[in-house]
């Protein structure tokens, strides 16, 4: 990889093992965890990141309402399996055969199961809601330097195109990103608005995956945005499919 | 140039233990994945994993976690597998190979035996 | 894990005669970020340890004769020795270093008809 050529290290992921092995002793880079190859110029799916985190020696409402079908990551961290393009396999398993289905950013959308349960297709996370609370400060931000500087982090730091962040919406304290992809509209080389997505949240909680880089430092009009929680939903091309037991509790 | 020179021949008990070394010569050693390979007679080639002496991140074949152990000693460019509670399906050549796309380098093999 | 399946198992080829060794695997060993397939052949002779002789599927080791060629792509891969010498009596293997664990084929034994 070229970006990993100087000095052999992976800018875009600290959760790597670099080696001058590759091909015509060139630098490689190889996700802990998986051991696949990992493209250093762009993100790194968060398939693999999951993988080398559970490997590693761990009013007036302008605001968005997630739809009923919109889910939240509550199952937490565990070791995923990933396919050989490094995205998450439909169905996910533990160690003691619990099974169950995933979306294509690796969160659950069934109800847990046995080794019977069928997963016949991974299916596209295409809406990505992120919901901030910015910690306070002297007045609000001003929406459009707010919403400039969001887009611009996404563009530059995540390297996602412009077009997939839909919409930044500002009611102070709160902030919400919206990102939408679907699969017609994801060419080759774009980064996947659930793999920016997760590095943006590593991002926000101090734990960035970028190789030497500092942390966020997230300024508007040189005002420091911190953020004090985040709440992420994903929207499913599909409906999740989950029994009314859960729905009900 | 590169060299991988592994320890000799090894005639053990069942349930006794085991630690074959692997020493590295011609190259820098932290900076390259060095895997280990078990041949059983007459059969074919199986990973049992492989260490990254410069950071000591290990991966294993989950078929021989517990049965194998892998170490390196940076000092002494040295690579170690020790394996554990053997039994007869043991017994078997070991190799240890330098990883990659030019891994064109492996040891003389080691042969393990366990009889009674 | 990916499985490694070789065909044939044994094959006896005249001298001077075309070799071909099958390799397919479970999944695919392209990997989408470089557009290299991670997939080897090594060669194995009696008390030696394996050499290695293509990398990347079709990449030639340094000093591997020209004979050797590899080819094939994301599951279905091939190993050619196009006018096979009595030195390449062997036992050839492929193997997958795309994830772990890497695995090999069980083996392929080439002898002189």
């Known amino acids: 990889h070229t970006a990993a050529q100087d000095n052999c290290t992976c800018p875009t992921n600290k959760m790597t093992v670099c080696s001058p092995d590759g091909p015509g002793g060139r630098c490689q880079c190889r996700a802990l965890g998986s051991g696949m190859a990992v493209d250093c110029s762009t993100l790194t799916s968060k398939c693999l990141l999951l993988k080398a985190r559970m490997s590693a020696p761990k009013n007036a409402r302008t605001l968005v309402r997630p739809s009923e079908h919109a889910l939240v990551d509550n199952d937490g961290l565990y070791d995923p399996d990933c396919d050989p393009e490094g995205r998450f396999k439909a169905r996910q398993c533990n160690q003691t055969s619990v099974c169950w289905c995933v979306n294509s950013v690796g969160v659950r959308r069934t109800d847990k199961g046995d080794l019977s349960l069928r997963c016949d297709e991974l299916v596209r996370t295409h809406h990505i809601l992120i919901d901030l609370r910015h910690r306070p400060t002297a007045g609000a931000f001003n929406h459009s330097d707010l919403d400039a500087e969001l887009r611009r982090l996404f563009r530059e730091r995540y390297r996602l195109h412009p077009k997939f962040v839909a919409a930044v919406h500002y009611e102070q304290p709160t902030i919400q990103i919206e990102l939408r992809q679907n699969t017609s509209q994801k060419a080759a080389g774009d980064v996947d608005i659930g793999d920016a997505a997760y590095y943006f949240e590593r991002d926000i909680k101090g734990e960035s995956l970028f190789q030497g880089r500092g942390g966020l430092d997230l300024r508007v009009r040189g005002e420091p945005l911190q953020v004090e929680r985040t709440l992420i939903y994903y929207l499913d091309e599909i409906p999740p499919k989950f029994s009314m037991k859960r729905l009900t509790a | 140039q590169v060299q991988l020179v592994q320890s000799g021949p090894e005639v053990v008990k069942p349930g006794a233990s085991v630690k074959i070394s692997c020493k590295a010569s011609g190259y820098t050693f932290t900076i390259y994945w060095l895997g280990w390979v078990k041949q059983a007679p007459g059969q074919g080639l199986e990973w049992i994993g492989n260490?990254?002496?410069?950071?000591?991140?290990?991966n294993y074949n989950e078929k021989f976690k517990g049965k194998a152990t892998l170490t390196a000693d940076t000092s002494t460019s040295t690579a170690y597998m020790e394996l554990s509670s053997l039994r007869s399906e043991d017994t078997a050549v070991y190799f240890c190979a330098r990883e990659g796309s030019n891994s064109g380098y492996w040891g003389q093999g080691t042969l393990l035996t366990v009889s009674s | 894990d990916i499985v490694m399946t070789q065909s044939p198992d044994s094959l006896a080829v005249s001298l001077g005669e075309r070799a071909t060794i099958n390799c397919k695997s479970s999944?695919?060993?392209?990997?989408?970020?470089?557009?290299?397939?991670?997939l080897a052949w090594y060669q194995q002779k009696p008390g030696q340890p394996p050499k290695l002789l293509i990398y990347g599927a079709s990449t030639r080791e340094s000093g591997v004769p020209d004979r050797f060629s590899g080819s094939g792509s994301g599951t279905d891969f091939t190993l050619t020795i196009s006018s096979l010498q009595a030195e390449d009596v062997a036992v050839y293997y492929c193997q997958s270093d795309h994830i772990y664990p890497y695995t090999f084929g069980q083996g392929t034994k080439l002898e002189i008809k």
């Open positions: 260490i990254f002496p410069g950071s000591a991140y290990i």
């Open positions: 999944q695919s060993l392209l990997n989408s970020g470089n557009q290299q397939n991670y």
